[in-house]
């Protein structure tokens, strides 16, 4: 006889998360970002794939493009021309790097309900976009830029020198895409479509990374990418502007580079149009502690662009690199000359400043021991921005409005008290003139997207509240999460701890540290996630901790720039310090502590394992950097300087994983990498493996053939299954 199972308690009807739940994306959430097309209208793709236009003020909606039309060309994306006469439909999406992809484009004429025939676009196209007004098209095909006055017209070829892997027009090369622009495009229409600015990248002299792509053929293919590693020759960049009405008149006109920038190696960092005849360019010295913002004006008489020295604004860091991860971009005010920009104040916190004439005379708009993170919109009377000021939690994001029409300017937190427990991490999307805006809350509760009136901040409607997800989670035993801080030697270490559902402080639990730790990153954020570590806590009873140490962002320059020219030291120290503090808390089994990380996190986890502290039993490094000499120049040199004797070669050599091969002898190490990683090359793990073999140190490894830095698709399932087995074995947990 067996006693009957009791089902009356809620605890008993609930189940733990499974690995299958995570791999199937069972508990993924949705967000709603309106595709704004005016002050009060937006487009959205409905559940049945119709493209619907919503008018907030009339409350009406209508389908502008049916799912039937979308399906007829297998479209996965669309773009409405600003004059609402045409829609481009994107199909045959083929991913290249992080942002870049090629696609086939069809133009649909809304006035007659037919696809535009004659002068069809070539395929595949690398980038295509409408002008901001009307229906001009700019596109990049085979590294050259073309212009169409209207979709049915023949194209005007703007550039002729484009060449695969050599000259890139209107699109970035690998390093600019990944490390500088963070976009797939490098062309920018002026506000009314009069001019088109574009970048030309010359990669002729850049060394090439080559790796095998195995595919299914008898012989593997070799992938060649011009990829400047630290200290190598960089791309040569030039910026041109062409008049799109009279493109052949004087042709593309080059925008001059500020003399103080042009005197040595430099980067172009961003372009911002101010008016149709005023443009703002940002440049950066190769040693990335000096940035110059240059405002240029069109000279009608000469048909050239003039960038007077009086309109050059210098931003310099004396304690680290310029900016945060990137140098911030300006948001211009209505006078078309003054602007708002985020940079470090005298106390070393990133804040909004108003620049009217010189940077020295900048007026500080926000201040405090917290940071302004993003300026969303500046209108005639308001400035909307996000910060982590509220309740002094650096891992939160709230949206604020500052009235700039009145004096003194008044500040209001738009989001702080909306759904206080559920929502502490917001972003926003504004319609024209900030007439309306959408708020997207990422957590810590279930994400929710709402629509608001731009004048009153009143909530108009819920756009997406993830009801299905809420219902699905009702019978799931989710782990508990807490965000707290440790004060150690004048350093504040914020951490997030993920605890098993029935956590009991009197018991001992295995601890897994998940680390990223890269410069200007933040792992401890008040966001919702049901992921692999949620499963490890829920089902496998592990405690997982994420720690933001020195080098991480949004807590001031002292913490951020602490790692300048010294990568691989303090990030590791701070993870170790945190682990020691966690052990002191009394519920960690100090014989079962592991660390894992991906990319920069793989580098940190490897160094932590090889720190010789004896704290870690095992660890995993996925796609780690192993030597900074192997990584991209733009990223690496920002934080490390150059690998030359008279600069920082010594620390480049001291900070490798290979130099610590001997120290892996007393830990279980799992090394994982994709063979087609275009970002952190397989070379990094190959060198770790070689060093470990040469030191006769045993370790485990897994490669993923033809997979890039993201290890996507079926590899993801294999990866997390494999890592789960490894951790359970390390922690002596039964399978």
């Amino acid at each position: 006889l067996r006693p009957s199972r009791v089902h009356n308690s809620e605890e008993n009807t609930m189940r733990a998360l499974t690995l299958k739940d995570i791999l199937n994306g069972t508990f993924s959430y949705k967000t709603f970002f309106p595709n704004w097309i005016s002050g009060q209208e937006y487009l959205h793709q409905s559940a049945d794939n119709n493209i619907v236009l919503y008018n907030i003020e009339t409350g009406q909606s209508y389908t502008i493009l049916s799912n039937r039309t979308m399906k007829s060309v297998n479209a996965s994306n669309y773009g409405l021309s600003p004059d609402r006469q045409f829609v481009y439909l994107e199909s045959d999406y083929s991913k290249l790097w992080r942002y870049s992809y090629t696609a086939t484009y069809y133009i649909y004429d809304l006035s007659n309900g037919e696809f535009v025939r004659g002068n069809e676009l070539p395929r595949p196209i690398q980038y295509l976009c409408w002008s901001p007004v009307g229906s001009k098209l700019a596109y990049v095909y085979q590294n050259n830029i073309y212009l169409k006055q209207r979709p049915g017209d023949p194209p005007f070829q703007i550039t002729f020198n484009g060449r695969e892997n050599k000259i890139f027009n209107g699109i970035p090369d690998w390093v600019y895409e990944e490390e500088m622009l963070a976009t797939k495009y490098a062309l920018w229409w002026s506000p009314n479509g009069k001019f088109l600015a574009y970048a030309e990248f010359n990669d002729t002299d850049i060394p090439v990374i080559a790796y095998s792509y195995y595919g299914d053929e008898q012989y593997p293919r070799t992938i060649n990418i011009p990829y400047p590693k630290a200290g190598a020759k960089n791309p040569v960049v030039r910026i041109f502007i062409i008049d799109t009405t009279y493109p052949a008149y004087v042709g593309p006109q080059e925008v001059p580079v500020p003399a103080m920038i042009a005197s040595s190696d430099y980067y172009f960092s961003w372009l911002t149009w101010v008016t149709d005849e005023r443009v703002c360019l940002q440049w950066l010295k190769r040693v990335q502690n000096v940035s110059v913002l240059s405002i240029c004006d069109f000279r009608e008489d000469w048909q050239t662009w003039d960038c007077p020295k009086t309109q050059e604004h210098i931003e310099e860091s004396r304690t680290g690199w310029a900016g945060g991860f990137f140098v911030s971009t300006p948001v211009f005010s209505y006078d078309a000359i003054s602007y708002y920009k985020i940079f470090s104040d005298k106390d070393g916190y990133k804040h909004i400043h108003y620049i009217k004439d010189t940077v020295e005379n900048a007026i500080q708009i926000t201040s405090g021991k917290w940071e302004a993170i993003n300026i969303f919109r500046v209108t005639q009377d308001s400035l909307f921005y996000s910060s982590n000021e509220f309740e002094e939690y650096p891992g939160r994001r709230n949206i604020y409005r500052i009235s700039i029409g009145s004096y003194p300017p008044s500040k209001k937190c738009v989001t702080c008290h909306l759904r206080k427990e559920r929502c502490q991490y917001y972003t926003a999307s504004f319609s024209d003139y900030a007439k309306y805006y959408a708020l997207v809350c990422y957590g810590p509760g279930i994400p929710i997207s709402t629509l608001h009136d731009g004048r009153t901040d009143q909530e108009i409607k819920i756009l997406e509240e993830n009801k299905e997800l809420e219902n699905a989670l009702k019978n799931i035993q989710l782990p508990k999460e807490e965000i707290k801080k440790l004060e150690v030697d004048e350093i504040t270490l914020w951490y997030k701890m993920i605890l098993p559902p029935q956590f009991d402080r009197s018991k001992k639990y295995p601890l897994l540290i998940q680390v990223y730790g890269g410069p200007c990153s933040q792992s401890v954020r008040s966001v919702f996630a049901v992921n692999w570590i949620s499963y490890l806590a829920s089902k496998e009873g592990m405690v997982i901790a994420l720690v933001d140490g020195r080098g991480t962002a949004f807590q001031g320059d002292k913490l951020l720039y602490a790692v300048y020219r010294k990568l691989g030291v303090y990030e590791v120290e701070d993870q170790i310090t945190a682990v020691r503090k966690f052990i002191e808390m009394g519920f960690i089994d100090e014989k079962r502590i592991a660390i894992w990380g991906w990319s920069y996190g793989g580098y940190v986890s490897s160094l932590a394992l090889a720190s010789g502290t004896g704290l870690f039993k095992c660890g995993i490094a996925v796609a780690p950097v192993s030597s900074w000499e192997y990584y991209a120049s733009v990223y690496t040199e920002r934080f490390m300087g150059l690998p030359t004797k008279d600069d920082n070669l010594e620390h480049y050599k001291n900070s490798t994983v290979m130099a610590r091969a001997e120290y892996f002898r007393n830990v279980d190490y799992l090394l994982i990498h994709g063979t087609a990683d275009d970002n952190v090359h397989f070379q990094n793990s190959a060198q770790i493996a070689k060093a470990l073999v040469n030191a006769q140190v045993d370790f485990q490894a897994m490669w993923y053939s033809d997979q890039n830095h993201g290890l996507s698709g079926l590899s993801t399932n294999h990866l997390y299954t494999h890592m789960t087995h490894f951790l359970k074995q390390c922690f002596s947990l039964s399978d």
Partner: antibody, heavy 118, light 107 residues
């Protein structure tokens, strides 16, 4: 389909004036540079004038500068050429043409004959 | 102004012949060169734009090449309807100029 129809040609005495019109249809007239090209009897083609999409920018051949004025009315989809101080050498068929990108003439009207003779 | 010189000024050819007309600019015009066909009493018709791009609806026997100062129009196999006058044209600095024309006649 794109159509350009010229009108206003005829016989005029030297020193006289004439106004040519060109009615455009089948395309978004306000978005394009428009132009006049002429062809004297038995001769080749000669560009006369062009006007930008908004009408604020114009160009003229040296042979007509100061005598001819190009204009447009985007609300009426019509292009004009005001010809003053006409000379015998202005005798030609005048074509209205769309000057795409300010570079090539992709659509032409059928032409209107202007004869300057006493 | 940029001068455009066409050669020959006239030519006689038979149906099926390969015909080549050249055009020289007095200074470099990059690829901004266009070709037109004109039949008696009719308006000119665009054949080739930007030196080598075939205008929509124009038969593929017409092709263009060249850049800088020297350009060529080729008719790979002359058809009866191709007997006409051909003009080259450039538009650098928004000052369009035409060649003097090449008359293609039946041999």
């Amino acid at each position: 389909e794109v159509q350009l129809v010229e009108s206003g040609g005829g016989l005029v005495q030297p020193g006289g004036s004439l106004r040519l019109s060109c009615a455009a249809s089948g395309f978004t007239f306000r978005g394009y540079i428009m132009s006049w090209v002429r062809q004297a009897p038995g001769k080749g083609l000669e560009w006369v004038s062009w006007i930008g999409p908004e009408g604020s920018r114009t160009g003229y051949a040296d042979s007509v500068k100061g005598r001819f004025t190009i204009s447009r009315d985007n609300s009426k989809n019509t292009l004009y050429l005001q010809m003053n101080s006409l000379r015998a050498e202005d005798t030609a068929v005048y074509y209205c043409a769309r000057l795409l990108y300010g570079t090539w003439f992709d659509y032409w009207g059928q032409g209107t004959l202007v004869t300057v003779s006493s | 102004d940029i001068q455009m010189t066409q050669s020959p000024s006239s030519l006689s050819a038979s149906v099926g012949d390969r015909v080549t007309i050249t055009c020289r600019a007095s200074q470099s015009i990059s690829s901004y060169l266009n070709w037109y066909q004109q039949k008696p009493g009719k308006a000119p018709k665009l054949l080739i734009y930007a030196a080598s791009s075939l205008q929509s609806g124009v038969p593929s026997r017409f092709s263009g090449s060249g850049s800088g100062t020297d350009f060529t129009l080729t008719i790979s196999s002359l058809q009866p309807e191709d007997f006409a006058t051909y003009y080259c044209q450039q538009a650098r600095l928004l000052l369009p100029t035409f060649g003097q024309g090449t008359k293609v006649e039946i041999k």
